[in-house]
Interface confidence: low
Amino acid sequence: MRTEAQVPALQPPEPGLEGAMGHRTLVLPWVLLTLCVTAGTPEVWVQVRMEATELSSFTIRCGFLGSGSISLVTVSWGGPNGAGGTTLAVLHPERGIRQWAPARQARWETQSSISLILEGSGASSPCANTTFCCKFASFPEGSWEACGSLPPSSDPGLSAPPTPAPILRADLAGILGVSGVLLFGCVYLLHLLRRHKHRPAPRLQPSRTSPQAPRARAWAPSQASQAALHVPYATINTSCRPATLDTAHPHGGPSWWASLPTHAAHRPQGPAAWASTPIPARGSFVSVENGLYAQAGERPPHTGPGLTLFPDPRGPRAMEGPLGVR
């Protein structure tokens, strides 16, 4: 059974503003920001299925249920692409498809869904409790990622259990929704500040963060956005990931991939690109990328192939045909 990930109920933001402005005054802007950020959010679904004929082979199907146009799809395993996951395939609607072992066949299914067959042999073969993730970069929604895996007790031919909720990665320039909401939030907060100008100016405190997190960004809308991005996330099992990235990502492929930076081709991630903050819900995971770094005045690290991936405008290879129909 394939389950399409639903955006979960959002937890309230952690206290980030302390000082003269009272708690009640801050509730409304947080609520407004939270509601606006999540209004009309798209969905990503992931289906992982073991082939009955080859018990060590998997088929991963992913789809995007947003209204925007997809600019890139990245499939990874071992967790989200920017959080320890290893890229298996990258699909571009015009430039074509690039895949790395053990990916056998990555294909477009429709304009908004893809599938990937994984070959199960050798050190880089998947196993039943591997987590597979699909990230859809879309304009104007931004990047959305969802993950799924087979339960260890799955019979061959069965599909994955319900997919974990999608991980929002607001990392595309011009994400109109979030930008607009944040702008509105800023204006509203300024309005509140003006109303309270006779009081002492608020001290902006960094939110409580885990030791692994990048330094907290003392900016209220950023924290509000992080609050809106809190989503449950399944524990990542990495025991079945390939021993080395070189074996998983052999070089070669169409000419338009030739100029792909080595680090991006091997592992498009940057450790500082994913913020991990404590969340009341058990096993929660939050990821925030370029959009919020930009707000904090930081330039995010290059975390994926999206920026420099397609230097050849001609795209010498047409996109491969899809596998299956949704």
Epitope: R2, A52, T53, W108, T110, G321, P322
Partner: antibody, heavy 119, light 107 residues
Framework: DVQLQESGPGLVKPSQSLSLTCTVT?????????WNWIRQFPGNRLEWMGY???????NYNPSLKSRISITRDTSKNQFFLQLNSVTTEDTATYYC????????????WGQGTLVTVSA | DILLTQSPATLSVTPGETVSLSCRAS??????LHWYQQKSHRSPRLLIK???DSISGIPSRFTGSGSGTDYTLSINSVKPEDEGIYYC?????????FGGGTELEIK
């Protein structure tokens, strides 16, 4: 083995509604896939009408959007086609189908049911 | 909508011949093009998926090729039981669309 069987009146009067049922055996319609209605006109032209997904989401052919509704009864493992304001142009053989490819590339279709729109 | 144009509309061949049926899409369907055979008073049967992928249970004399907007179904050494109408179908984007069909007649 998955089987689909269409049923419904073979004759419908113009301006009335056409209602067909597809009964599925061998697989739960809430488990997966998209459950489609396709029709074939007397001249053999085939037209995809729309589908209802396992989760209840629907997708219709824009040419029929104002007249078509696809629903389901999960307890009976059936899904339904309703086409409103029919004309003689809607006379066709109506198929229900899973346009889904499993690992052998198999596609399941019903046997089809002929519906004639006539006064 | 993506328009699929099949040619020829009808084809009459003798057993043993090799025939090619064409399907042209109004825009790129990225090989999400599927071929069906329909015999009289029967439901369509899938012959080829994704332009060139063979289907288990379908004779190997049926082969598909093509990419972009132009696709071909070839039948090597036609047999009498191959008589019927052949349709191409694109499932790349909704609304899904079928070609008008090529009727294959065996002399």
């Amino acid at each position: 083995d998955v089987q689909l069987q269409e049923s419904g009146p073979g004759l419908v009067k113009p301006s009335q509604s056409l209602s067909l049922t597809c009964t599925v055996t061998g697989y739960s319609i809430t488990s997966d896939y998209a459950w489609n209605w396709i029709r074939q006109f007397p001249g053999n032209r085939l037209e995809w009408m729309g589908y209802i997904r396992y989760n209840g989401n629907t997708n219709y052919n824009p040419s029929l959007k104002s007249r078509i509704s696809i629903t389901r009864d999960t307890s009976k493992n059936q899904f339904f086609l309703q086409l409103n304001s029919v004309t003689t142009e809607d006379t066709a053989t109506y198929y229900c189908a899973i346009i889904y490819y499993d690992y052998d590339g198999f596609v399941y279709w019903g046997q089809g049911t002929l519906v004639t729109v006539s006064a | 909508d993506i328009l699929l144009t099949q040619s020829p509309a009808t084809l009459s061949v003798t057993p043993g011949e090799t025939v090619s049926l064409s399907c042209r899409a109004s825009q790129n369907v990225y090989e999400n093009l599927h071929w069906y055979q329909q015999k009289s008073h029967r439901s369509p049967r899938l012959l080829i998926k994704f332009a060139s992928d063979s289907i288990s249970g379908i004779p190997s004399r049926f082969t598909g090729s093509g990419s972009g907007t132009d696709y071909t179904l070839s039948i090597n050494s036609v047999k009498p039981e191959d008589e019927g109408i052949y349709y191409c179908l694109q499932l790349y984007s909704t609304p899904y669309t079928f070609g008008g069909g090529t009727e294959l007649e065996i002399k």
